[in-house]
């Protein structure tokens, strides 16, 4: 069972006395709706609150919005709907915040059918005031913010049109006419795709893909037989249609889309799809749906060009286009990234990868579990995580898995342990050195989340029943203590922190139901009483990442070096405090095979590190053969890594091969053979 | 099989310094933290401090702070203690002992491997 | 610092006796503990670590347990071997050992 109460545990003294005196309750004079919150800006404590109440009558809607702002972190909260001049507004299009700690928020507001456009609220002070601009066109998209520049603003129209405001909203103009989609790239550009003929839906496979760096002035056509575009880490990707038939392949630029190389990944048909699952400056994990309904695919990782791929993981869960999938980067570790592949029996099980999709293994069973009713083997089976699949299924899974980056090794999830994820009610498990080992947390589903970078985790059980009791850990969710908020318990609808887990504060949302009427209420509760003290020297201890064998002169080696930790001892009941920054120390190691990838037109044997040149090109590796760039295709077999650090060691170089020579093939016509694309 | 062997006995006038090493042979001397411990005549145990030979971390007990330096050279596997400002109650013998890991944490599952001991005497 | 409280500081037993040594934190510690056993003249040698976890080579008479402040080190049937000093350690603070406990033949 999960440690708890009943044990001897680190006990926090007199902590229900200072949780009390810092609790804050504020009922919202609002009948129940929706409600949405954001955080404006790092560390201000600013918070705006929307709620919405929808009355569908027989002709039309009749709804109301009301804006709350707080300034001390949800403690308490100010009605401000009159600075938006008690306006409706729309909930879908959310609250658009700017980047970093620009202090601009955009609200898109409900205007009545025959208007000419729609209209904003906009904030530059962190929501102490609006100003109202009526919009030249009606949104069909919330703003989106330049990265680099949280003045300029884009936005689509209703009718496909491109906007851009170069003043935070305050002037707009139309920059381009039939436009599908539209992104901001880095240095303020812009990269949208257009239709020629129809609609973006009947020239889907026929779109051109533009750009323009001087927010509309020129533009420049990218690429055409566009089908759509994606935007990863340096990388820039198109699904471009082959000539031939109704295939698509990915091209890849790393020069905003000056030039493009193919990819050399398989082309899928019209019912698959490619998504971008996770991407750094280093490199992409990119899946590529298997032909028919089956709801997997393979993920394959990129060199650092994004060309050359290899493949890291086969039958993975990933249902249609724009679906579901558990792939989940977890940020706590370096490397580690978590999925669900479908077995060949249909039953779904967690992967986990500790060295960017190189190897993928089951999850350790934690210590304290046994298996369940799924195991065939009793002693033998794995933890298996609950994530973005489970809950679409509507299994009784409250939240996917939680990592932060500042609280390091650090992962929670809901799992079930056998052998494969099971429909029976999950528990809540965690891992403190980045998923190598786990343990039982809590006993049934929770909603949690991660304070004081780490030094608190606080939970809430997943009840259908009203609640007025959370549970709060020191010790990275080794022993528990319960504290009741409320007398009168609330229907709770979610746990609100501020983003980057530094905050020790924790909104716990809820409404109470009456017989007439029904409110929404919150609760804030502050923990820097709990943690009396500042986290000194002497409450950190080293831990080596990814170590796995202390006898191994290279243990921790992941991706050329390793990395040794401060982190917090989980006896230490301190505070590491808002300016926390995670004490690092990498060391370079020594190069093996382990370092490289296989170049195009090299392979991995089983059970061997090194690379050996394919017999014969055929399918994807041929068309890449045949219509890749000239340079692509020279090669001494090995490429090292991504984002690798290793020095010295193993030195895999060899003779440089030409393997144009390699790239015919009976199938495809001579003139083919011939031309090169760039 | 892991050894730890200790430099010889030291005799020390008060207020000099002393220097032990501890040379590791037979494993992965940089994967483990070593530590130094010291048990004065008829006493208990008593940690003075410990280092990560990868990146040379230390770290002292509060006790010896400021009068103690702990080093490591991974070249040649060996750890150093240094103890400064000598007196007599510094008298005792010297450990260093290898902490044993499982995990990543280095200094969480007790000393596996000591050296024999190197005896410090502090007299005028 | 953290401290350890060893008890009894000393306890005579005889071959075949179950000796048990107890060992309280000041604060919790997990199970960040280690048991040792030293004799004259020699350096301590890891009998058990992660307060219940037996380090290999030594024997199963020996057996700790326990959690956050409360730890017991059992030797279930003395041996001649045994007569020594035992010492408690904790590791999740900065490294303190407990006072010690001799075991001497009654």
């Known amino acids: 069972s999960a440690p708890g109460e009943d044990e001897e545990c680190g006990r926090v003294r007199d902590f229900v006395a200072k949780l009390a005196n810092n609790t804050h309750q504020h009922v919202f004079d609002d009948l129940r709706g929706s409600v949405s919150l954001s955080w404006v800006g790092d560390s201000t404590g600013v918070i705006l609150v929307l709620t919405t109440f929808h009355v569908p009558l027989v002709i039309m809607t009749f709804g109301q919005s009301k804006l709350y702002r707080s300034e001390d972190y949800g403690k308490n909260f100010k009605d401000i709907t009159d600075l938006i001049n008690n306006t409706f507004i729309r909930t879908e299009f959310g609250m658009a915040i700017g980047p970093e700690n620009s202090g601009k928020v955009v609200l898109t507001a409900e205007v009545s059918g025959g208007s000419r456009g729609g209209r904003i609220f906009r904030s530059s002070d962190f929501a102490k005031n609006f100003v109202q601009t009526d919009l030249p066109f009606h949104p069909l998209t919330q703003m989106m913010y330049s990265p680099q520049n949280s003045d300029y603003l884009l936005a689509l129209s209703t009718e496909n049109g491109l906007w851009v405001s170069k003043n935070f909203g305050g002037k707009w103009e139309e920059i381009h006419k039939a436009v599908c989609l539209a992104k901001w790239g880095s240095d303020n550009t812009i990269f949208f795709t257009t239709y020629a003929n129809g609609s973006c839906k009947a020239d889907l496979g026929a779109l051109e893909l533009w750009r323009t760096s001087d927010l509309g002035k020129s533009f420049k056509t990218i690429g055409v037989k566009i089908y759509s575009f994606g935007l990863g880490g340096r990388f820039l990707f198109a699904s471009v249609m082959a000539d031939k038939d109704t295939t698509r392949r990915i091209h890849v630029s790393t020069d905003q889309g000056d030039t493009w190389s193919m990819a050399q990944l398989p082309s899928v048909g019209q019912e698959q799809f490619y998504s971008i699952l996770a991407a750094n400056d280093d490199m992409v994990f990119m899946h590529v749906d298997e032909p028919g309904d089956t709801g997997f695919g393979t993920i394959f990782t990129s060199d650092d060009r994004g060309i050359v791929y290899s493949k890291s993981l086969d039958r993975h869960l990933y249902t249609t286009t724009g679906g579901e999938t558990d792939f989940t980067n977890v940020t706590s570790l370096r490397g580690v990234y978590i999925t669900s592949v479908l077995s060949e029996d249909n039953s779904i099980q967690t992967m986990i990868t500790f060295d960017q999709g190189g190897r993928w293994t089951h999850l350790r069973k934690p210590e304290n579990s046994e298996c369940d009713a799924t195991a065939k083997n009793k002693n033998e089976c794995s933890l298996h995580i609950h994530a973005s699949y489970s809950i679409s299924q509507k299994l009784n899974v409250p939240m996917a898995p939680l990592s932060e980056p500042n609280a390091v090794g650090i992962v929670i999830a809901h799992g079930s342990v056998g052998d494969a994820i099971s429909v029976m009610v999950p528990d809540v498990y965690i891992s403190d050195d980045g998923g190598y080992s786990w343990t039982k947390m809590l006993e049934g589903p929770h909603y949690y989340t991660i304070l004081d970078s780490g030094g608190i985790i606080v939970a809430i059980e997943h009840s259908s029943r009203p609640i007025n009791v959370i549970k709060f850990s020191t010790d990275e969710g080794q022993c528990w203590q319960t504290y009741t908020f409320t007398r009168d318990p609330i229907y709770f609808t979610g746990l609100a922190s501020e983003p980057g887990a530094r905050s020790m504060n924790i909104s716990i949302w809820g409404f109470t139901e009456s017989f007439l009427t029904s409110q929404w209420v919150s609760y804030t509760i502050d923990f820097k009483d709990i943690l009396e003290r500042n986290c000194e020297e002497k409450d950190y201890t080293i831990w080596l990442a990814h170590s796995t064998d202390p006898e191994d002169y290279e243990d921790g080696c992941i991706a050329g070096y390793k990395e040794q930790f401060l982190r917090l001892r989980k006896s230490s009941v301190c505070q590491n405090g808002r300016d926390y920054v995670v004490t690092k120390q990498p060391s370079i190691c020594l190069c093996s095979l382990e370092d490289f990838l296989c170049d195009f037109g090299y392979y991995r044997p089983e059970n061997d590190s090194k690379c050996v040149e394919q017999p014969e090109l055929k399918g994807h590796d041929l068309e890449f053969c045949l219509y890749g760039r000239e340079e692509h295709l020279t090669t001494n077999g090995y490429r090292k890594i991504p984002g690798d650090k290793c020095q010295g060691g193993v030195n895999p170089v060899r003779e440089v091969k030409d393997l144009k020579k390699k790239c015919t093939s009976n199938f495809l016509s001579p003139e083919k053979q011939n031309s090169k694309s760039n | 099989q892991v050894q730890l062997v200790q430099s010889g006995a030291e005799v020390k006038k008060p207020g000099s310094s002393v220097k032990v090493s501890c040379k590791a042979s037979g494993g992965t001397f940089r994967n483990y933290a070593i530590s130094w411990v010291r048990q004065a005549p008829g006493q208990g145990l008593e940690w003075m401090g410990g280092?990560?030979?990868?990146?040379?971390?230390?770290n002292y007990a509060q006790k010896f702070q400021g009068r103690v330096t702990i080093t490591a050279d991974e070249s040649t596997s060996t750890a150093y203690m240094e103890l400064s400002s000598l007196r007599s109650e510094d008298t005792a013998v010297y450990y260093c002992a290898r902490q044993g890991r499982k995990t990543g944490y280095y200094y969480y599952y007790g000393m596996d491997v000591w050296g024999q001991g190197t005896t410090v005497t502090v007299s005028s | 610092d953290i401290q350890m409280t060893q008890s009894p500081s000393t306890l005579s037993a005889s071959v075949g006796d179950r000796v048990t040594i107890t060992c309280r934190a000041s604060q919790s510690i997990s199970s960040w503990l280690a048991w040792y056993q030293q004799k004259p003249g020699k350096a301590p040698k890891l009998l058990i670590y992660k307060a219940s976890s037996l380090e290999s080579g030594v024997p199963s008479r020996f057996s700790g347990s326990g959690s956050g402040t409360e730890f017991t080190l059992t030797i279930s049937s003395l041996q001649p071997d045994d007569f020594a000093t035992y010492y408690c350690?904790?590791?999740?603070?900065?490294?303190?050992f407990g006072g010690g406990t001799k075991v001497e033949i009654k």
């Open positions: 280092i990560i030979p990868i990146g040379g971390w230390a």
């Open positions: 350690q904790q590791a999740d603070g900065h490294i303190t």
